[in-house]
């Protein structure tokens, strides 16, 4: 993929078209959050991305142009984690059941759930259509990508004293300059082909000593599987 390090996702690059086939856009008249397709009929996103009506857009690259690979499917069920806490953003995870099955192809496909927790130092891919400016507003039309490492839980907790639960982890750069941002929420953090994280929160975007905070999907695999089974 062409690399442009000036101001994407913040500090990322334009993803190669449809190179993140599990990435979805949640739309309510505008893109407001991302998500990840985990099977033909289910999407994982962030709990704080809850809205009563959501259209899930799959196969997107440029969200402002119909490019021919898109599938727009309304949400049939939107299930936020029962212990989601708006104040702390603990348990910031949500499942969306599509009203019809997605057609799986080269441009729309699923991502695997994790089989082990994220290991410190692992390089991950974060993607989304969120703000590309660390201050101000510059929302891209084309999907942005960022390669970033998993930080140790100690560094994560030191960056956000008293705010990091066991259901959260940090990914990014303590020096700042590269991070997810507003509009990336709910989107994927994929490490070694597994969905390890969901974009959740942070103190600003790309600020020094304030890395991005992500929901630890590994802790919710059982809940995800049970919820899908109970709603199939």
């Amino acid at each position: 993929a062409p690399f442009d390090d000036d101001d994407k996702i913040v500090g990322g690059y334009n993803c190669e078209e449809n190179s993140v086939p599990y990435q979805v856009s949640l739309n309510s008249g505008y893109h407001f959050c991302g998500g990840s397709l985990i099977n033909e009929q289910w999407v994982v996103s962030a709990g704080h991305c809850y809205k009563s009506r959501i259209q899930v857009r799959l196969g997107e690259h440029n969200i402002e142009v119909l490019e021919g690979n898109e599938q727009f499917i309304n949400a049939a069920k939107i299930i936020r984690h029962p212990q989601y806490d708006r104040k702390t953003l603990n348990n910031d995870i949500m499942l969306i059941k599509l009203s019809s099955r997605a057609v799986i192809n080269a441009r729309v496909s699923t991502i695997s759930l994790p089989t082990a927790p994220p290991a410190t130092g692992t390089k991950c891919l974060i993607s989304g259509w969120g703000n590309t400016a660390s201050s101000g507003a510059d929302y891209p039309d084309e999907l942005q990508c960022l390669d970033a490492p998993v930080l140790s839980q100690a560094k994560c907790e030191a960056s956000y004293p008293g705010k990091i639960t066991s259901n959260m982890f940090c990914v990014g750069f303590l020096e700042g300059g590269k991070d997810s941002c507003q509009g990336d929420s709910g989107g994927p953090v994929v490490c070694n082909g597994q969905l390890q994280g969901v974009v959740s929160w942070g103190d600003g975007c790309a600020q020094k000593n304030k890395p991005g905070v992500y929901t630890k999907v590994y802790n919710y695999v059982k809940w995800i599987k049970n919820t899908i089974a109970a709603n199939s």
Epitope: Y30, F32, R86, L89, A137, G183, D184, S185, W201
Partner: antibody
Framework: QVQLVQSGAEVKKPGASVKVSCKAS????????ISWVRQAPGQGLEWMGW????????NYAQKLQGRVTMTTDTSTSTAYMELRSLRSDDTAVYYC??????????????????WGQGTTVTVSS | DIQMTQSPSSVSASVGDRVTITCRAS??????LAWYQQKPGKAPKLLIY???SLQSGVPSRFSGSGSGTDFTLTISSLQPEDFATYYC?????????FGGGTKVEIK
């Protein structure tokens, strides 16, 4: 259906306080925020402040800082706006309006899709 | 603070006319702009959100466009019920700010 119903008109003396209520129905109160907007006679719209219904986080217009307090009561799905040390130029119609939450790294969009009917506050000696 | 400048402040038009109202932000706000219609003695009503998305129940003769700093509200064929005051609002950052309003009057 989704609606916001505000308390009735008030007449106050300069220096007094007023508290306007806004009762929400037809949606989950804590999934949204409430903004307060006022409109003086013959004038345009002036934003006063914003409150998260779930966390009670607030953001006030600078010119009203120290005089305005916004609160919510989640048990009754009601938002309140109190304005103190009233002056004659506070005479206006006060509106509450529903908007998106500002939370996490969700898209930051703070438009207002549902409005209350308005509460007339007259400040006169 | 982001200043919103609306023009014109008033426009006289006839039923069936195409009416265009512009709104300029003092700094870039991406697509985060809303348009409201207000009739005398009534609360504002949301017409357009996120610059170009039509609010449910609003007639398709209303449309919005723009991104960054320059935005437009267009009424393709003015109807008698459209005579009102229209406001833009930046929905990108606090403090929320409104344009000064455009009054659409009968010619």
């Amino acid at each position: 259906q989704v609606q916001l119903v505000q308390s009735g008109a008030e007449v106050k003396k300069p220096g007094a306080s007023v508290k306007v209520s806004c009762k929400a129905s037809g949606y989950t109160f804590t999934d949204y925020a409430i903004s307060w907007v006022r409109q003086a006679p013959g004038q345009g719209l002036e934003w006063m402040g914003w409150i998260s219904a779930s966390t009670a986080d607030t953001n006030y217009a600078q010119k009203l800082q120290g005089r305005v307090t916004m609160t919510t009561d989640t048990s009754t799905s009601t938002a309140y706006m109190e304005l103190r040390s009233l002056r004659s130029d506070d005479t206006a119609v006060y509106y509450c309006a529903r908007g998106d939450e500002v939370v996490g790294k969700r898209t930051y969009y703070i438009g207002m899709d549902v409005w209350g009917q308005g509460t007339t506050v007259t400040v006169s000696s | 603070d982001i200043q919103m400048t609306q023009s014109p402040s008033s426009v006289s038009a006839s039923v069936g006319d195409r009416v265009t109202i512009t709104c300029r932000a003092s700094q870039g706000i991406s697509r985060w702009l809303a348009w409201y219609q207000q009739k005398p003695g009534k609360a504002p009503k949301l017409l357009i959100y996120a610059a170009s998305s039509l609010q449910s129940g609003v007639p398709s003769r209303f449309s919005g466009s723009g991104s960054g700093t320059d935005f437009t509200l267009t009424i393709s064929s003015l109807q008698p019920e459209d005579f009102a005051t229209y406001y833009c609002q930046q929905a990108n950052s606090f403090p929320i700010t409104f344009g000064g309003g455009t009054k659409v009057e009968i010619k």
